[in-house]
Interface confidence: low
């Protein structure tokens, strides 16, 4: 069975994978692939190291740790819902059937919606989607854009739809209000 890891849309996802090199710089080839580990190699390879180096990579996948010390954990930049699924970390130890295989399940959740404060007489309510990326450095807050503006005729419908939803709870908990007039 797979170990499950979670991230929100727009965040970086972190999938840990480690091994201990026999000696410093005596590296073992590693591949990362999208999909469960097959019998040999990795399917849909997104990143690969060999005995010396990173020899294949794709644009949103990177190694943040020191892979020369055996930290081959994968970071996926700016994830989307399409990044959900199983990822294979395969440590290709020499010898027949010696490979260490790890299947990691990545679950991507939609970004939380945080309301922007609105002016008292502003008839449009826009909710910029704010998120915080967690990583090794300081947190960054990014605005990914706004949901469509909501006009007066839609507000009562919106209120009804929100009443029992998690978003309504979020809005209430944050003290956000929509004022009319």
């Amino acid at each position: 069975s797979e170990v499950e890891y979670r991230a929100e849309v727009g965040q970086n996802a972190y999938l840990p994978c480690f091994y201990t090199p026999a000696a410093p710089g005596n590296l073992v080839p590693v591949c990362w692939g999208k999909g469960a580990c097959p019998v040999f190699e990795c399917g849909n390879v997104v990143l690969r190291t060999d005995e010396r180096d990173v020899n294949y990579w794709t644009s949103r996948y990177w190694l943040n740790g020191d892979f020369r010390k055996g930290d081959v954990s994968l970071t996926i930049e700016n994830v989307t819902l399409a990044d959900s699924g199983i990822y294979c970390c395969r440590i290709q130890i020499p010898g027949i059937m010696n490979d260490e295989k790890f299947n990691l399940k990545l679950v991507i959740k939609p970004a939380k919606v945080t309301p922007a404060p609105t002016r008292q007489r502003d008839f449009t309510a826009a909710f910029p989607r704010m998120l915080t990326t967690r990583g090794h450095g300081p947190a960054e807050t990014q605005t990914l854009g706004s949901l469509p503006d909501i006009n007066l005729t839609q507000i009562s419908t919106l209120a009804n739809e929100l009443r029992d939803s998690r978003l309504a709870n979020d809005l209430r908990d944050s003290g956000a209000t929509i004022r009319i007039g």
Epitope: N55, Y56, W62
Partner: nanobody, 124 residues
Framework: QVQLQESGGGLVQAGGSLSLSCAAS????????MAWFRQTPGKEREFVAA????????LNEDFVKGRFTISRDNAKNTVYLQMNDLKTDDTGVYSC?????????????????WGQGTQVTVSS
């Protein structure tokens, strides 16, 4: 398009250190895969190190052997090569290069933009 300008070269004694910088023009630096190459006397130009847009590093362990590190500062549009424990064999012209490639091999990427190079001389 990006223009590249190296600096930091010079004369250093064996065992010493140098830090090379490569400043890039333009506001799209973070989109580029960046690399250092070197041309040493009597040899073809060889790959030294590369760093991807997101920070994955590649080093030529044939001669680097833990002595060099590559880093980048996207806010300053600059890539660095820190060279320690320099040997006389490291003497040569060091050039930085940029590629918009976003996958594949770092060492054999298609580097479209090159700096003029900076001379590094290591004396015994």
């Amino acid at each position: 398009q990006v223009q590249l300008q190296e600096s930091g070269g010079g004369l250093v004694q064996a065992g010493g250190s140098l830090s090379l910088s490569c400043a890039a023009s333009g506001r799209t630096f973070k989109n580029y895969l960046m690399a250092w190459f070197r041309q040493t006397p009597g040899k073809e130009r060889e790959f030294v190190a590369a760093i991807t847009q997101l920070g994955t590093r590649s080093l030529n362990e044939d001669f680097v052997k833990g002595r060099f590190t590559i880093s980048r500062d996207n806010a300053k549009n600059t890539v660095y090569l820190q060279m320690n424990d320099l040997k006389t064999d490291d003497t040569g012209v060091y050039s930085c290069a940029a590629s918009l490639q976003s996958g594949g091999s770092l060492r054999y990427a298609k580097y479209d933009y090159w700096g003029q190079g900076t001379q590094v001389t290591v004396s015994s």
